[in-house]
Interface confidence: low
């Protein structure tokens, strides 16, 4: 789901931003400003900030203060500068509920002037309200406790879809607001381990009855966790073909630090796993490759404006880092090696992750170390090479005339299972080999077009390779011609 854009007629205000969730910036721009006070582990946490999305503010600002938190909202430049939210003192009725019941009372009075009825409603509602707040303040988890922070009232009653739909981070990121991220993370129950590797583990978890994926990084891959966290929290990355980020957290568990990245859960697993078990028809094959191309094009492009994003190159694109969704599309995962580029400042942010990409998918210029490391386009071209290999993996599993190839990884016939840098360099740079295109592909128009496309991703000269946008357009064209063919029949 794309993040909701501010309504055109909504005025934006400058707000004071205080608290560690402000991304080290002391102001922010939004449709409403807020000042909040919440109890965190028994201590008062004051925060100020803004809501970029009007609905988010509406939802939060209407929440009456409780013993656990209070939020005061306002509209106007710097209007929250001198506002300090106050927790209600015991015994006092809450202003929020007073106003609410006053409105209700007037409506009832106008209909059936029953003042006593209003008193009854007030009594019952306040009793219910008190009880609900007591329940909410009970620790949810003995080991961690629940961090009661801004908007967590709504977290308890919202689905992830709703939260992400109306999310506004204090930066321009694509996840939940910072305070909510930690709350969500601490409310997750790990159910089953669905993947293990050098990176750590992936678990299926449950949050409020919804499935989420929890990637638990090994301590040696801490920089990948930091990089993904940094990226998702500073770049607007919400796109149907990029794995949906929910939250990131660092916890001390069993006396060791655990690094969690929480994302949407896709039960079909990775494209790598999916291709082992499934053969594809033309439609599903094109849906897969077009969705990957769309995700990659979104990563590669820089979008300007308030809802913009830096250009990003993935640097570890492979079938294991692509997930299959229920609708047959895919989404790109694992941004732990990603590089960012901003045209306006001409800044290239390579990060400092010692991890390197997967050798099997490395482009010739990476293998022979001729890559221009200070040029962002170089990294995009590396992604295109890898995309071509993924395209080949997928195309092999597309049935034509009743024939299909077994799933095999790229270069399966010329390098060992865990190829070394030198193995790959010899095959790709010295011998300039490319994955074999089976003859049967040329008797199918779609596979013929895909073969041509992948070859244009595999040029030895990086600058000759296609761009992600061109690939996306070509695949869309192939897809459309298939539709036309179907309607003509």
């Amino acid at each position: 789901v794309e993040d909701e854009k501010p309504k055109v007629n909504q005025k934006l205000y400058m707000c004071v931003c205080e608290g560690l969730s402000c991304g080290n910036e002391d102001h922010c721009e939004g449709q409403q400003c807020f000042s909040s006070l919440s109890i965190n582990d028994g201590f008062h946490v004051y925060q100020k900030g803004c809501f970029q999305v009007y609905e988010q503010g509406k939802m939060t600002c209407k929440t009456p203060p409780s013993p656990g938190q209070a939020v005061e909202c306002c509209q106007g430049d710097w209007c929250n500068r001198n506002i300090t939210a106050q927790l209600p003192t015991k015994g006092k009725s809450f202003p929020g509920t007073q106003n609410f019941h006053l409105e209700v009372g007037l409506i009832i009075l106008s209909v059936v002037f029953a003042v006593c009825l209003l008193a009854c409603i007030l009594g019952v509602a306040l009793r219910k309200f008190k009880r609900r707040n007591q329940e909410r303040l009970n620790p949810r988890d003995v080991e961690y406790g629940t961090i009661e922070g801004l908007i967590t009232t709504n977290v308890g009653d919202s689905t992830l879809a709703e939260l992400l739909d109306h999310s506004c981070t204090s930066g321009s990121g694509s996840g939940l607001p910072f305070l909510v991220q930690r709350t969500v993370a601490r409310q997750i129950t790990l159910l089953e381990c669905v993947g293990k590797g050098r990176y750590g583990e992936v678990w299926r978890g449950s949050w409020q009855g919804e499935n989420v994926a929890v990637k638990i990084f090994s301590s040696r891959d801490e920089k990948s966790w930091f990089r993904e966290t940094e990226l998702y929290n500073t770049v607007m990355l919400r796109h149907e073909n990029i794995l949906g980020f929910i939250a990131s957290d660092m916890t001390s568990r069993h006396s060791s630090t655990q690094l969690w990245l929480i994302t949407h859960y896709h039960e079909m697993g990775s494209l790598y796993d999916y291709l082992q078990l499934t053969t594809l028809d033309t439609v599903s094959c094109l849906r897969i490759v077009l969705s990957i191309a769309s995700g990659l094009a979104h990563l590669h492009i820089e979008i300007f404006g308030t809802q913009g994003k830096s250009a990003i190159a993935h640097r570890d694109l492979k079938s294991k880092n692509i997930l299959v969704k229920k609708n047959g599309q895919c989404c790109i995962a694992d941004l732990g090696l990603a590089v960012m580029h901003s045209q306006s400042t001409n800044q290239l942010d390579v990060g400092n992750n010692p991890r390197v990409g997967t050798k099997r998918y490395m482009a010739p210029e990476v293998l022979d170390e001729t890559i221009q490391v200070d040029c962002f386009d170089s990294y995009k071209r590396v992604d295109i090479w890898a995309f071509g290999l993924v395209l080949w993996e997928v195309a092999r599993r597309m049935v034509s005339n009743g024939i299909v190839e077994d799933y095999k990884p790229p270069f399966y016939d010329v390098v060992p299972n865990d190829p070394s840098f030198e193995d790959m360099r010899k095959v790709v740079c010295v011998d300039q080999q490319r994955p074999n295109i089976p003859n049967r592909w040329f008797s199918d128009p779609t596979l013929t077009s895909l073969a041509k496309l992948m070859k244009e991703c595999w040029y030895q000269n990086p600058s000759a390779r296609l761009t992600a946008l061109r690939i996306k357009k070509t695949l869309t064209k192939i897809d459309n011609s298939l539709d036309k063919l179907k309607t003509d029949c």
């Epitope: 080290n24 966290t229 940094e230």
Partner: antibody
Framework: EVQLVESGGGLVQPGRSLKLSCLAS????????MKWIRQAPGKGLEWVAS????????YYADTVKGRFTISRDNARNTLYLQMTSLRSEDTALYYC??????????????WGPGTVVTVSS | EIVLTQSPTTMAASPGEKVTLNCLAS?????MTWYQQKSGASPKLWIY???NLASGVPNRFSGSGSGTSYSLAISSMEAEDVATYYC??????????FGAGTKLELK
């Protein structure tokens, strides 16, 4: 993550000026709030100044207010500290530090190795 | 402005000994951050959010506290733990005040 290297330190006479620089690499500099922290010989750490990501908000310790100016050039990945009217008590090892706010109530801090400023006649 | 007072100023511990360093705030704070600084090196983030160990910090370290009283503990002192430890309270706005530090030595 960001790596930081300070430069510009040296021996200077009281009342004179000096400009320190801190070059950042390895990450997008503009994502980080920056600060200068100093440590007098054999003493503890003292926060000197802070600057927000886009230079909108700048803060100084009372001991340097009016004499020191913190600034940054995001295009050059560089943080500066212009020091004027230097005093002997400004003698210290000056560290630049970067802070990124992650999704919890605390900072990740990255520090440079420091540059020595000696104010003496 | 919150003042942080660390105690003791200096302490020596034998290998294997349990060590506790204290940090007292002049008024109640929400959480505490600790830094380790070895001789001739830059300070390193050691404990954040009162009790969370920074990456690479051995599990023998722990942090605790609330209100005005915070502490850093080492369950079993090792030679590599010799350093000066500073506490810091990060507020929304500066000034940021560090404690004066506790120098931990090996007996």
């Amino acid at each position: 993550e960001v790596q930081l290297v300070e430069s510009g330190g040296g021996l200077v006479q009281p009342g004179r000026s000096l400009k320190l620089s801190c070059l950042a690499s390895g990450s997008t500099f503009s994502n980080y709030g920056m600060k200068w922290i100093r440590q007098a010989p054999g003493k503890g750490l003292e926060w000197v100044a802070s600057i927000s990501r886009s230079s909108t908000y700048i803060y100084y310790a009372d001991t340097v207010k009016g004499r020191f100016t913190i600034s940054r050039d995001n295009a050059r990945n560089t943080l500066y500290l212009q020091m004027t009217s230097l005093r002997s008590e400004d003698t210290a090892l000056y560290y630049c530090a970067a802070a990124i706010s992650t999704p919890f109530y605390w900072y990740f801090d990255f520090w440079g190795p420091g540059t020595v400023v000696t104010v003496s006649s | 402005e919150i003042v942080l007072t660390q105690s003791p100023t200096t302490m020596a511990a034998s290998p294997g000994e349990k060590v506790t360093l204290n940090c007292l705030a002049s008024s109640s704070v929400s959480y505490m951050t600790w830094y380790q600084q070895k001789s001739g090196a830059s300070p390193k983030l050691w404990i954040y959010g009162t009790s969370n160990l920074a990456s690479g910090v051995p599990n023998r370290f722990s942090g605790s506290g609330s209100g005005t009283s915070y502490s850093l503990a080492i369950s079993s002192m090792e030679a590599e733990d010799v350093a000066t430890y500073y506490c810091l309270h990060l507020t929304s706005y500066p000034p940021y005040t560090f404690g004066a530090g506790t120098k931990l030595e090996l007996k």
